[in-house]
């Protein structure tokens, strides 16, 4: 039985050229995390963090994606094309798979504030 919940940074905005932290947190379960996947809006894989073998950033994103903090992901040098949904997938045992969603809006405005708070989707 899956008792856990994924808390995410929810809907966030950041300015073009800046950076943003995508963060998910699995709570309310004792399940062991074997792997966390980060996917983009078109379901292309950005990175995985395997519990034993660590971080693997997909080569196409290596210059703009940094691992962490924690199981999160930092996107750098943001472009307007980065606007969209991002998904964290937690592979765990014995529970199975948990999935969280974040929506990132990249703003042209230099006054765009980075707004982030943890939400339960």
């Amino acid at each position: 039985m899956m008792t856990g919940t994924i808390e995410t940074t929810g809907n966030i905005s950041a300015k073009k050229g800046g950076s943003v932290i995508l963060q998910c947190h699995l709570s309310s379960t004792m399940a062991q995390v074997t792997q966390v996947n980060w996917e983009q809006h078109d379901h292309s894989l950005l990175a995985i963090r395997n519990a034993e073998l660590g971080w693997h950033i997909y080569p196409a994103f290596k210059d703009r994606v940094a691992p962490g903090p924690g199981l999160g992901l930092t996107l750098q040098s943001l472009t307007m094309n980065d606007t969209g949904e991002y998904f964290c997938t937690y592979h765990t045992y014995p529970d199975g798979t948990y999935r969280g969603r974040i929506f990132l809006e990249v703003l042209e405005s230099s006054v765009a504030e980075h707004s982030a708070r943890f939400q339960i989707p």
């Epitope: 074997t34 996947n37 073998l53 592979h91």
Partner: antibody, heavy 125, light 106 residues
């Protein structure tokens, strides 16, 4: 075709070290982890550990910690397993194996579909 | 570490028989369970991964089922080339194998 080719049989004295190589071909070496499994004569399979050919990170079986080192050379698509302070009970066939899933599949890793032919290591005085 | 107990350790069967091998984990491993076939002097061959997914190129007479702690490998109609030793392996860290089941000709 996808294959792993291992180095030849070795005979070692107790206390010595052995280094087994595993050359990969037919796929993108850095996209898959490589595991090592051994099998003593007439016995079952024993997990030794594995290595990410992408970032070099390793994870070893507890009982071999401190005696085993796994490395890769991405320029030659070769994985290596070195075992030190050999004992008679290290006599076994040593296999390298490639994970079924690439890092970029997004699937959980840990099943091995491509195996080397095995390297017999005999430890005897 | 999670212990994997296979049963039986050996069995005798005839061509055409339905053969069932079981594997029990000492704690729940969800569906992180793989099955291999090994013939003497050869490397293991992956048959089933993630408890029930048939590996490419493996005949459909092989099937896997189960989740949690109890898993089964079934050969629906044993063929001459199926006489071998079968191992389960759990892929929860740290990985471990079952002790093996030798399938012999009756």
């Amino acid at each position: 075709q996808v294959q792993l080719v291992q180095s030849g049989a070795e005979v070692k004295k107790p206390g010595a070290s052995v280094k087994v190589s595993c050359k990969a071909s037919g796929y993108t070496f850095t996209s898959y982890p490589i595991g090592w499994v051994r099998q003593a004569p007439g016995q079952g399979l024993e997990w030794m550990g594995w290595i990410s050919s992408y970032n070099g990170n390793t994870n070893y079986a507890q009982k071999l910690q401190g005696r085993v080192t796994m490395t890769t050379d991405t320029s030659t698509s070769t994985a290596y397993m070195e075992l030190r302070s050999l004992r008679s009970d290290d006599t076994a066939v040593y296999y390298c194996a490639r994970d079924l899933k690439s890092f970029w599949s997004g699937d959980v890793l840990g099943a091995f579909d491509i195996w080397g032919q095995g390297t017999m290591v005999t430890v005897s005085s | 570490d999670i212990q994997m107990t296979q049963s039986p350790s050996s069995l005798s069967a005839s061509v055409g028989d339905r053969v069932t091998i079981t594997c029990r984990a000492s704690q729940s491993i969800s569906s992180y369970l793989n099955w291999y076939q090994q013939k003497p002097g050869k490397a293991p061959k992956l048959l089933i991964y993630a408890a029930s997914s048939l590996q490419s190129g493996v005949p459909s007479r092989f099937s896997g089922s189960g989740s949690g702690t109890d898993f089964t490998l079934t050969i629906s109609s044993l063929q001459p080339e199926d006489f071998a030793t079968y191992y389960c392996q759990q892929s929860v860290p740290p990985r471990t194998f079952g002790g093996g089941t030798k399938v012999e000709i009756k």
